[in-house]
Interface confidence: medium
């Protein structure tokens, strides 16, 4: 089934302090999927989309240096005939780059 | 299109250092992590460990940690693959490779290293 | 350290025949509904190319000759029918933790 869409959302993050907003959006005829974030080709978070709703906005808490660097990817699945899931292709990467400083 | 060129064979004495070059193209680097792999002559495939391209951060495999160095020039679309203290057993194909989706989707050419005194 | 285990190490197939490779890993390659195998056709003197990626998605450019199936330890590549240029030596790969690993290979020769 056809990958999501990948997009950072304002507010931006101007420093690694700063929370991240990603939204990830199945094609309209998948609303209500189950939503993967990666992150440097590990899990970072799990969403469901509502019913009614095709994309998910995954919100990130800024200071996680633990977290794998890299680009971000999503992927979502649906459950399909006899309820068997059924896994989208991953997104195309998105990179978070910060400002830099002035001073 | 999306190439990565290798530097060419080397040809060193045991004890000496390799820096084997890989300049990619076609595609934005840093959006993808960089993976070398070694094959010995008529062996198989050794996944060496990998770069991330846009952190900077290595890792590597058990037996490539201490000799072996993954580094990048970004600007110049590089990554860069040095082996310190060559040894008769480093004598093998060097191959740098893009990760996508979490396979090697693209090779370098491959980089021959010979360690003969 | 995932362990990837190929069957056969070589094998001769007719043209216009079938050639299915086994790979079996010593633990799970599986996270989150994804089957984190892929597989590799190597020619002598070039690098290996990729067919298969996260065990049955085939790579752009690939003839869909080439097929892939499996979960959890237990993965094919099937070849069908096979083409004189399909003679190769042919790796599965993990990506699911590292290290990552490579089999052993298997070689295909055409008769």
């Known amino acids: 089934i056809p990958a999501p869409s990948i997009r950072l959302v304002p507010p931006y993050p101007s420093s690694q302090e700063d929370p991240i907003h990603i939204a990830c959006m199945a094609p309209g005829n998948f609303p209500g999927a189950n939503f993967t974030l990666y992150r440097g080709g590990q899990v970072v978070q799990l969403l469901q989309a509502p019913t009614d709703q095709r994309g998910v906005t995954f919100n990130l808490s800024g200071g996680s240096s633990k977290a794998p660097g890299g680009p971000f990817h999503c992927q979502y699945g649906v459950l399909g005939e006899l309820n068997q899931s059924q896994l989208s292709d991953l997104s195309e990467p998105v990179n978070v780059s910060f400002p830099v400083p002035t001073w | 299109q999306i190439q990565l060129v290798q530097s060419g064979p080397e040809l060193k004495k045991p004890g000496e250092t390799v820096k084997i070059s890989c300049k990619a193209s076609g595609y934005t680097f840093t959006n993808y992590g960089m993976n070398w792999v070694k094959q010995a002559p008529g062996k198989g495939l050794k996944w060496m460990g990998w770069i991330n391209t846009y952190t900077g951060e290595p890792t590597y495999a058990d037996d490539f940690k201490g000799r072996f160095a993954f580094s990048l020039e970004t600007p110049a679309s590089t990554a860069y693959l040095q082996i310190n203290n060559l040894k008769n057993e480093d004598m093998a194909t060097y191959f740098c490779?893009?990760?996508?989706?979490?396979?090697?989707?693209?090779w370098g050419q491959g980089t021959s290293v010979t360690v003969s005194s | 350290k995932i362990v990837l285990t190929q069957s056969p190490a070589s094998l001769a197939v007719s043209l216009r025949q079938r050639a299915t490779i086994s790979c079996r890993a010593s633990?799970?390659?599986?996270?989150?509904?994804?089957?984190?195998m892929h597989w590799y056709q190597q020619k002598p003197g070039q690098p290996p190319k990729l067919l298969i990626y996260r065990a049955s998605n085939l790579e752009s450019g690939v003839p869909a000759r080439f097929s892939g199936s499996g979960s959890r330890t237990d993965f094919t590549l099937t070849i069908d029918p096979v083409e004189a240029d399909d003679a190769a030596t042919y790796y599965c790969q993990q990506s699911n933790e590292d290290p990552r690993t490579f089999g052993g290979g298997t070689k295909l020769e055409i008769k």
């Open positions: 633990e799970s390659v599986d996270s989150y509904g994804n089957s984190f």
């Open positions: 490779v893009r990760e996508h989706f979490y396979a090697l989707d693209y």
